[in-house]
């Protein structure tokens, strides 16, 4: 008996073939010999069936012996035998429905588990296989889960279920409400203006929740919070905001904030957490701050970096279209008696410059 | 909702090949066939072919000796290929779904043959 | 093939006005015809279909009869969304037919 898979709420086609190339008369029954369809002359007849509003079947084809039974919108309760009888034979074809679909909503926040429910009928004793869109492989039977979701879980999920070495491929939507970055970092030279952005992973027809961006200064002793916004529908509004520094933020997404200057006060890292409405848990993106300054009083040349900085990082003064440079591994080096000319402080990353800073020394006489 | 997006080169020369793909979202293409129609002032509407799921091909036999439907069952897309088109094969060229009748259709894709 | 001719080719009428639009085939197809309506710039849209079913958010105003070679669509009272084109098709075998349409004007 030849087994067919079908897709809940999809459409399949049980085909019924005549070894004749031509209109012939033939019927369709279930398990219980109740009648689905027929033909009666040219007709298509329904019979007392459960599915006869959803089976149908392709006239054009008869003419080549073709008698397939369309079944519309599946249930898994038509899983069941069916029987095509045509020619005084009977093909018996039978027909598993499943289902797969996602415990809780398909829109999740980053950590959160998933579960994945597979609906099927009785009797059957399916494996279920998913991968993810970056290539994760999960198997499992009736439940598959997913402990925690990471950003490139987001995508569409394809899921195979296996029954009689015949299969079934499902497609599940999955979009992990996350920040792009997990962590990002600004660096800036004293007094210049410092811009944070936070873009979305995702999008949201309606994105409304409330956030909040705590930041703990270097040189402080205890982090706080420095602005307070709503989201509603995609629009940002501010609803509290510390007096130094006195920040900015963007009215429309992606979140974004401005401090009008990069002071070594500042230097430091954030944590903007984003709760949206009608989920549990909330979106989180650190941001670090890294401020440089290069001073010169009397016959010391002096640059320093605040903020949070890797140990690898080099920093280096360093005379132009001169050799004379100094460098350290360190957050601050300084050159006595320096020479004229103009100088360049370098903050640098095995040789890429992540911020550098001017500084003039003029001749003393 | 099932609804189909179609897409394709506009203008040809006579004696090219026209590509056109067309992508089912909102459902499956299991079950049912897939078919392309085409409409022109001078012929009015007619059907140019069909495919399935499985690549089960049926064809209008006046233009079969030039037609090539296909099927992406991974994308969720069938396209048609129409080989050595003349200024006759000027039409609007519609994707759509057929049990035995059409529905729903794509919005149309416009493509002239011309020198 | 199957030829399937539409009449008349064009009608004018009024808002309000019962119109009845005919098709005929050249071979008994039974009930295995359709009727699609299509406006200026748009794909068809299928109305009726099985001679007489009609297709799920079609106004009740359409109505579809006939079985054999000869069928007719009606419209009961006419709206002003119901003036465009109207084709017959056929499902009977293939290839699949279509009339070649019935222009219907504003009077």
């Known amino acids: 008996k030849k087994v067919v898979l079908g897709k809940k709420g999809d459409t399949v086609e049980l085909t019924c073939n005549a070894s004749q190339k031509k209109n012939t008369q033939f019927h369709w029954k279930n398990s219980n010999q109740i009648k689905i369809l027929g033909i009666q002359g040219l007709f298509l007849t329904k019979g007392p069936s459960k599915l006869s509003d959803r089976a149908d079947s392709r006239k054009s084809l008869w003419d080549q012996g073709c008698f397939s039974m369309i079944i519309k919108n599946l249930k898994i309760e038509d899983s069941d035998t069916y029987i095509c009888e045509v020619e005084n034979k009977k093909e018996e074809v039978e027909l598993l429905v499943f289902g797969l679909t996602a415990n809780s909503d398909t829109h999740l926040l980053e950590g959160q588990s998933l579960t994945l429910t597979l609906e099927s009928p009785p009797g059957s004793s399916p494996s279920v296989k998913c991968r993810s869109p970056g290539g994760k492989n999960i198997q499992g039977g009736r439940t598959i889960s997913v402990p925690q979701l990471e950003r490139q879980d987001s995508g569409t999920w394809t899921c195979t279920v296996s029954q009689d070495q015949k299969t079934v491929e499902f497609k599940i939507d999955i979009v992990v409400l996350a920040f792009q970055k997990a962590s990002s970092t600004v660096y800036k030279k004293e007094g210049e203006q410092v811009e944070f952005s936070f873009p979305l992973a995702f999008t949201l027809e309606k994105l409304t929740g409330s956030g909040e961006l705590w930041w703990q200064a270097e040189r402080a002793s205890s982090s706080k919070s420095w602005i307070t916004f709503d989201l509603k529908n995609k629009e940002v509004s501010v609803k509290r905001v510390t007096q130094d520094p006195k920040l900015q933020m963007g009215k429309k997404l992606p979140l974004h904030l401005t401090l009008p200057q990069a002071l070594p006060q500042y230097a430091g890292s954030g944590n903007l957490t984003l709760a949206l409405e009608a989920k549990t848990g909330k979106l989180h993106q650190e941001v670090n701050l890294v401020v440089m300054r290069a001073t010169q009083f009397q016959e010391n040349l002096t640059c320093e970096v605040w903020g949070p900085t890797s140990p690898k990082l080099t920093l280096s003064l360093k005379l132009e279209n001169k050799g004379a440079t100094v460098s350290k591994q360190a957050k601050a080096v300084w050159v006595l008696n320096p020479e004229a000319g103009m100088w360049q402080c370098l903050l640098s990353d095995s040789g890429q410059v992540l911020l550098e800073s001017n500084i003039k020394v003029v001749p003393t006489w | 909702q099932v609804q189909l997006q179609q897409w394709g080169a506009g203008l040809l020369k006579p004696s090219e090949t026209l590509s056109l793909t067309c992508a089912v979202y909102g459902g499956s293409l299991s079950g049912y066939y897939w078919s392309w129609i085409r409409q022109s002032p001078g012929k009015g509407l007619e059907w140019i072919g069909e495919?399935?799921?499985?690549?089960?091909?049926n064809y209008n036999p006046s233009l079969k000796s030039r037609v090539t439907i296909s099927v992406d069952t991974s994308k969720d897309q069938f396209s048609l290929r129409l080989t050595s088109v003349t200024a006759a094969d000027t039409a609007v060229y519609y994707c759509?779904?057929?049990?035995?009748?059409?529905?729903?259709w794509g919005r149309g894709t416009l493509v002239t043959v011309s020198s | 093939d199957i030829q399937m001719t539409q009449s008349p080719s064009s009608v004018s009428a009024s808002v309000g006005d019962r119109v009845t639009l005919t098709c005929r085939a050249s071979?008994?197809?039974?009930?295995?015809l359709a009727w699609y309506q299509q406006k200026p710039g748009k794909a068809p849209k299928l109305l009726i279909y099985?001679?007489?079913s009609l297709q799920s958010g079609v106004p009740s105003r359409f109505s579809g009869s006939g079985s054999g070679t000869d069928f007719t669509l009606t419209i009961s009272s006419l709206q002003t969304e119901d003036f465009a084109t109207y084709y017959c098709?056929?499902?009977?075998?293939?290839?699949?037919?279509f009339g070649q349409g019935t222009k219907l004007e504003i009077k």
């Open positions: 099985a001679a007489s």
């Open positions: 098709q056929q499902a009977n075998s293939f290839p699949y037919t």
């Open positions: 759509t779904r057929v049990l035995n009748w059409f529905d729903p």
């Open positions: 495919i399935n799921q499985s690549g089960s091909t």
């Open positions: 071979q008994d197809i039974s009930n295995w």
